[in-house]
Interface confidence: medium
């Protein structure tokens, strides 16, 4: 999916008002320096691509993020403010419904959410030069 035509300011507002708090809650009890940010993005569409991938694609050691509240809010924001996004997600949604994995917080998931926090911060500061 091409995130170029999303309403970035509305997505940013959703992040600042609520998604950010959910990410902090998920990471509670974890030191902010515990994980190094290894995933980066260069502009807002690229950041949303990376955010979508890390949030919804199961990875080795962390298959359960899609059921978290921050993930569902992210999905809702993308569906609402990115034209045509929903249509691209229907097959993925059906597959996820079939899997229905139970939520398990692993160290790998914590690391992944730490990466997400970095990507969201980058999304909110699109004019900063890439490190």
């Amino acid at each position: 999916y091409d995130f170029t035509n999303c309403d970035f300011e509305k997505i940013k507002a959703a992040y600042l008002s609520t998604i950010s708090k959910d990410l902090i809650t998920y990471m509670s009890g974890t030191k902010s320096t515990e994980f190094n940010n290894t995933v980066s993005c260069s502009n807002r569409p690229h950041c949303l691509t990376e955010i979508q991938s890390l949030t919804f694609n199961p990875t080795a050691g962390c298959a359960s993020l899609a059921k978290e509240m921050f993930a569902m809010k992210t999905k809702a924001a993308l569906a609402i403010w990115c034209p045509g996004y929903s249509e691209t997600q229907i097959n993925a949604t059906q597959a996820m419904k079939k899997r229905r994995k139970r939520k398990v917080t692993t160290n790998k998931c914590l690391e992944q959410v730490s990466q997400l926090q970095g990507l969201w911060r980058r999304f909110n500061r699109p004019l900063l030069k890439q490190q």
């Epitope: 609520t18 959910d22 059921k67 509240m69 569902m72 809010k73 999905k75 929903s86 949604t93 996820m96």
Partner: nanobody, 112 residues
Framework: EVQLVESGGGLVQPGGSLRLSCAAS????????MGWFRQAPGKEREWVAT???????FYADSVKGRFTISADNSKNTAYLQMNSLKPEDTAVYYC??????WGQGTLVTVSS
């Protein structure tokens, strides 16, 4: 199997109010995200409002300040309180969950 049933639609005069309900079975409201959408005759379905399980809400600019979305987790029901209704609010109103399970819709007609 998720089932969503909307109710509360009807005919109302401009400036009037209606409260729509969306009763859900097969899902847990407190851990999901619910939305209201509408489709006017001859137009595409458009998003109206969203509420998450923790109570956070989002609104389309066209209804902000007039419509209020809420949920009663104990009843697994979402609500859309619509005030200061305008003729352009006339549409079939649908609720949907995050996995895009849809209700059958309820018709709201704003006319004098």
């Amino acid at each position: 199997e998720v089932q969503l049933v909307e109710s509360g639609g009807g005919l109302v005069q401009p400036g009037g109010s209606l409260r729509l309900s969306c009763a859900a079975s097969g899902l847990t409201f407190s851990t999901t995200v619910m939305g209201w959408f509408r489709q006017a005759p001859g137009k595409e379905r458009e998003w109206v409002a969203t509420i998450a399980g923790d109570g956070s809400t989002f609104y389309a600019d066209s209804v902000k300040g007039r419509f209020t979305i809420s949920a009663d987790n104990s009843k697994n029901t979402a609500y859309l309180q619509m005030n200061s209704l305008k003729p352009e609010d006339t549409a079939v109103y649908y609720c949907a969950d995050i996995n895009e399970d849809w209700g059958q819709g309820t018709l709201v007609t704003v006319s004098s």
